[in-house]
Interface confidence: low
Amino acid sequence: ADNFSLHDALSGSGNPNPQGWPGAWGNQPAGAGGYPGASYPGAYPGQAPPGAYPGQAPPGAYPGAPGAYPGAPAPGVYPGPPSGPGAYPSSGQPSATGAYPATGPYGAPAGPLIVPYNLPLPGGVVPRMLITILGTVKPNANRIALDFQRGNDVAFHFNPRFNENNRRVIVCNTKLDNNWGREERQSVFPFESGKPFKIQVLVEPDHFKVAVNDAHLLQYNHRVKKLNEISKLGISGDIDLTSASYTMI
């Protein structure tokens, strides 16, 4: 077994039923909707090495995408604020000290946003942080992607796929040093083409919890340890994006 356990280092996840999180889903057992006992990169005997999955998108691209994430910065470079509409919020962001006030929410201005959209998370993510994304799935949608990014790494890739070999599936993964790791797949699929949705991501000490339309969907164990450096959320895919924001709960 690997000799690092974030769960051991950061045990306990606070209030199991926090305000703002779906009430009936706040106290799931470890691995609910996800992968009980999921381990960390490199811990899977006989696992194909990251990047070795047949049909995988080229390095630097998101799985299932035709190419690289549009507008993605070169490694090690954080982009300056975009000049177009629907870009970074002009005010209301907490400072990049890593401390979030207990009030909020902070995030995108109201109204339609241009996709792909980058939501800055200036202090990184911290336990009890709740990210909420509202939008509508486009008709005949193929994919949605949320990418919690740490520089050029993708700490958490949440990727609903509407037609993968005629099946609907949600794929979660992590990309480190341009290599994708072991996919975690979820067959429960709460998205519908042409319909509105609400995605909520709750950061816990040892995992991300994801709820869609107020129902708990899955959780994903942290593979990237430095949560405070996960400083951007990329939102892409076949959606009309209404809002993206975060608050502490």
């Epitope: 990047g51 490694p75 341009n178 340890k225």
Partner: antibody, heavy 117, light 110 residues
Framework: EVQLVESGGSLVKPGGSLRLSCAAS????????MNWVRQAPGKGLEWISN????????YYADFVKGRFTISRDNAKNSLYLQMNSLRAEDTAVYYC??????????WGRGTLVTVSS | QSVLTQPASVSGSPGQSITISCAGT?????????VAWYQQHPGKAPKLMIY???YRPSGVSNRFSGSKSGNTASLTISGLQAEDEADYYC??????????FGGGTKLEIK
Amino acid sequence: EVQLVESGGSLVKPGGSLRLSCAASGFTFSNYNMNWVRQAPGKGLEWISNIDGSSRYIYYADFVKGRFTISRDNAKNSLYLQMNSLRAEDTAVYYCVRSYYGGMDVWGRGTLVTVSS
Amino acid sequence: QSVLTQPASVSGSPGQSITISCAGTSSDVGGYYNVAWYQQHPGKAPKLMIYYDSYRPSGVSNRFSGSKSGNTASLTISGLQAEDEADYYCSSSTGYSTRVFGGGTKLEIK
């Protein structure tokens, strides 16, 4: 079997040029970042350069910038290092290495480059 | 001169544990990315032993463990065996693909 095999090392005069090649097999070459690392006789390891799978992102150590050029041909499963303006201090075994989660997990056996008049 | 500082040599007896340190700065070891450790026997290519600070590739003995605190990374080898005698190098990312190595540590088994 995952394998990297370097070639092209030889004796060259100061100021001369050399092109190293690395043949990759046993894995999907285009999916991986690749590196060149060198080791002078009796000395430690020195990272030289890195190239991503699509040749979009390329990085060099300061001591080779402007003199060495890394490239790859995914169709041929090959990595290259073009070395110009060679100096005596470039004498070393040059390794072709695959990136893996911030480490480097597959190494070739190396090819010796000797720069001497 | 190496950017990362390692002791030139360490020694231990079979069955003992030893720790090799790798001191850097907030721009490398203590910064954004991660540390890897390599073992190199004379005349051989290096072998990856630890990556992403503390993970072992498959096939590497669990006697090898990695950790990081602040600007210093450490490799610990427990239950020393004769075949552990080798040179050990730490490496850190300084950006997203750029890397630096330590000067290496020679491990002697008494």
